[in-house]
Amino acid sequence: EPPTACREKQYLINSQCCSLCQPGQKLVSDCTEFTETECLPCGESEFLDTWNRETHCHQHKYCDPNLGLRVQQKGTSETDTICTCEEGWHCTSEACESCVLHRSCSPGFGVKQIATGVSDTICEPCPVGFFSNVSSAFEKCHPWTSCETKDLVVQQAGTNKTDVVCGPQDRLR
């Protein structure tokens, strides 16, 4: 009876369990009753990082110097190239696909320390009573408006991203 599942590092094809290709190799032809799976090494600047049945290897990532990127670790047939940013610049994400001089603090966060040549911007969450409604690389959290000092009352509570809304006091007749 033909198998319905295969062992680890195998795949099911034509009611048969074939060996997957090892990392660094791509599939050329599936196994048959009489032959093993045929695999070929990935070419220069290509890779596959898992046991696979891919017919094409992936291209190594290009670290584009026009985006401020440079190679941190050269790719192999089993690993992708790892990019990093030029000195003094910071990756915009873990994948490091582009570079920023320094990060900004999102709404709800204020700048605790402005970036320097050696350190990135340090952000801090706005505590109760303070807010930031902008992305900024220099603005701190701002205190909520004090309605009382303007002889007004709070009509809408503030948050870490919004100021309070003040309004006139209800006059009792």
């Epitope: 026009n66 401020g68 915009t92 582009s98 920023v100 900004s104 900024s136 603005e139």
Partner: nanobody, 116 residues
Amino acid sequence: EVQLLESGGGLVQPGGSLRLSCAASGFTFAGYEMWWFRQAPGKGLERVSAINPQGTRTYYADSVMGRFTISRDNSKNTLYLQMNSLRAEDTAVYYCAKLPFMFDDRGQGTLVTVSS
């Protein structure tokens, strides 16, 4: 495509003044925090000054506080840096930048040389 074109640099004597301009295009200028940076020969980028989108809040590095004034004209999509009481240590290429400061958004800069 973001374009930032700095101008107004030149040779000036110590104690003199210059006004730098940065003409912006390719983005909604009035919606962005803007910065001036500078890079002296053989040194890293130094943060000089910043201004919020509305032009109501500013930041100055200690080294230029009281001497430099940042401003913007959102109707002209232009950022300015008025530099007074210039010193030899202000000699650098000055760049403007928008938030976030993407590597490929940089302008060419304008050279300021303070020398007698």
